[in-house]
Interface confidence: low
């Protein structure tokens, strides 16, 4: 066959769907690879063809669109399963072509099983709620396009295994779940089950997401440098190892980049000739406030190194701070034999 622009297997879009539930999968060509949409392609006379490779097979085969009750169908650039079966797992390819043009991409589809408490190998999206921040809502995700607006589905929300009713601060509001005042105890997995009718059948959509209660922007502060500080002096003799920790506390801030760095005599360590290493560790509180520690290390410090300026810097969306470490050369203790000799007038 003639050449086809093959975008390969798009593993970035590993699609996971639950067994025995409807699934609608858009051809990724139009979303991520081509500069035109399906309507444009269709009106230009291009045809969208679907085929697949079963799990643990190499053979590409056409998708059977003649199954009972139209279990698998295609509508525009969407491949529909009503519903999925476990053995639908595999790599799916959509190909757009006419006599002069061809472009295709493959993507993995995994049909996963869930238990009665909605546990499964599904990768869960994380929704962050601010602690004690007034009413916040999460919305049942990825249900658009499954039923027309004229259909009123029933929606049931669960936290873990338990149906949400009589909860202190969580109220089901249709597609939304409202948290009156989010607390650490609200951390967990929340599932919405959307039930809707279609052509005399009843379908269920199960969507689980992880709620993580994080620090509120109301309480956020600029970075706080705990170390170095004015109370600790790094006193070393030449030849010893110099270790200076820079420990910084960052309030949680949504989408903020937290940065810590050292300067030595106003320059980044990479820009100077001394043999310095920097190791970083990061820890988080329950509300995702962050503590970063960068340890500056010079294995064998020289007297020149002990005269340099070592400054720890930190920056977040809330501001930038800096603190210099107090570094000095240790005054050597008097050498006993020499002093004695001098004291007795020895020559």
């Amino acid at each position: 066959s003639e050449r086809c622009d093959d975008w390969g297997l798009d593993t970035m879009r590993q699609i996971q769907v639950f067994e025995d539930e409807p699934a609608r999968i858009k051809c990724p060509l139009f979303e991520h690879f081509l500069k035109f949409n399906y309507s444009t392609a269709h009106s230009a006379g291009l045809t969208l063809i679907w085929y697949w490779t079963r799990q643990d097979r190499d053979l590409e085969e056409p998708i059977n669109f003649r199954l009972p009750e139209n279990r698998i169908s295609k509508e525009k650039d969407v491949l529909w399963f009503r519903p999925t079966l476990l053995n639908d797992t595999g790599n799916y390819t959509c190909m757009l072509r006419n006599t002069t043009y061809c472009s295709k991409v493959a993507f993995p589809l995994e049909v996963v099983q869930k238990d009665s408490c909605f546990n499964s190998p599904m990768k869960l999206p994380v929704h962050k709620l601010y602690i004690e921040y007034g009413i916040q809502r999460i919305t049942c995700p990825n249900v658009d396009g499954y039923f027309p607006s004229s259909v009123k589905p029933t929606i049931t929300w669960y936290m873990g295994c338990y149906k949400i009713q009589n909860f202190n601060n969580v109220i089901p509001e249709g597609m939304n779940l409202s948290f009156l005042i989010a607390l650490i105890s609200n951390n967990g997995n929340y599932t919405c089950v959307v039930t809707y009718p279609e052509n005399g059948r009843t379908f269920h959509l199960t969507r689980t997401l992880t709620v993580k209660v994080v620090g509120s922007p109301k309480n956020a502060v600029p970075p706080v440098i705990h170390s170095p500080n004015d109370h600790v002096v790094y006193e070393k003799e030449p030849g010893e190892e110099l270790l200076i920790p820079c420990t910084v506390y960052f309030s949680f801030l949504m989408d903020s980049r937290n940065e810590v760095w050292w300067t030595i005599d106003g320059k980044k360590p990479d820009d100077i000739t001394i043999d310095v290493t920097i190791n970083e560790s990061i820890s988080h509180s329950r509300t995702e406030d962050e503590t970063r520690t960068q340890i500056l290390s010079i294995k064998k410090v020289t007297s020149e190194d002990l005269k340099r300026s070592y400054v720890c810097h930190a920056r977040s969306a809330k501001g930038e701070v800096a603190k210099a470490a107090k570094v000095k050369q240790k005054v050597p203790a008097p050498r006993y034999t020499v002093e004695l000799a001098c004291g007795f007038g020895a020559t």
Epitope: S149, S150, K152, I164, Q165, N166, F167, I171, P172, E173, G174, S178
Partner: antibody, heavy 121, light 112 residues
Framework: QVQLVQSGAEVKKPGESLKISCKGS????????IGWVRQMPGKGLEWMGI????????RYSPSFQGQVTISADKSISTAYLQWSSLKASDTAMYYC??????????????WGQGTLVTVSS | EIVMTQSPLSLPVTPGEPASISCRSS???????????LDWYLQKPGQSPQLLIY???NRASGVPDRFSGSGSGTDFTLKISRVEAEDVGVYYC?????????FGGGTKVEIK
């Protein structure tokens, strides 16, 4: 921010028809209920009915069923309250209000400025 | 339909003093989900009503914390811890458990 802007005051004669409007902005109009509330001169609030613009699902108070029609056009984010034949007793201030729906209940978190309807011969 | 009865009809208040309004429903407003479906609204003179409290005890956005709501399934109370001059107007309770939604007759709060 959320806003509900109602049409202006109306003076009508008994037997005439009327349609007043309520335009929503600053939020997803299709996905919140819009309720209508009547306040007769010097009196309290009376709930007339409610509509879900997403699919035009409408509920009426029995006192107003058949007396008024509630409708919505989600394409222009507008809800309507209409009468086919006004009576003098329809003289009142009419408010539209956005309804939140927690579970199966409503609360009205945003209100229009009101439309004064006067019916007099 | 559920009948809502408010008392008192009129409440003269002194700024800085507390105030309390009662609302009684003809049947329980306690939903099976554990929430009490009662809202409180304030209509200031010449203005549209505004939401103060929803689901019995939750303050709406922007409502000062001097306002609080409480109650059982049928007896509800709106409290103002320290009345301010701007709190004058007519207070309405509304049951939100089932349609038709019904309002109480209102309590007029005025400065002594």
């Amino acid at each position: 921010q959320v806003q509900l802007v109602q049409s202006g005051a109306e003076v009508k004669k008994p037997g005439e028809s009327l349609k007043i409007s309520c335009k929503g902005s600053g939020y997803s109009f299709s996905s919140h209920w819009i309720g209508w509330v009547r306040q007769m001169p010097g009196k309290g609030l009376e709930w007339m009915g409610i509509i879900y613009p997403g699919d035009s699902d409408t509920r009426y108070s029995p006192s107003f069923q058949g007396q008024v029609t509630i409708s919505a056009d989600k394409s222009i984010s507008t809800a309507y309250l209409q009468w086919s034949s006004l009576k003098a007793s329809d003289t009142a201030m009419y408010y539209c209000a956005r309804g939140e729906l927690p579970g199966e209940a409503y609360y009205f978190d945003n209100w229009g400025q009101g439309t004064l309807v006067t019916v007099s011969s | 339909e559920i009948v809502m009865t408010q008392s008192p009809l009129s409440l003269p208040v002194t700024p800085g003093e507390p105030a309390s309004i009662s609302c009684r429903s003809s049947q329980s407003l306690l939903h099976s989900n554990g929430y009490k479906y009662l809202d409180w609204y304030l209509q200031k003179p010449g203005q549209s009503p505004q939401l103060l409290i929803y689901l019995g005890s939750n303050r709406a956005s922007g409502v000062p914390d001097r306002f609080s709501g409480s109650g059982s399934g049928t007896d509800f109370t709106l409290k103002i811890s320290r009345v301010e001059a701007e709190d004058v107007g007519v207070y309405y309770c509304m049951q939100a458990l089932q349609t038709p939604l019904t309002f109480g007759g209102g309590t007029k709060v005025e400065i002594k």
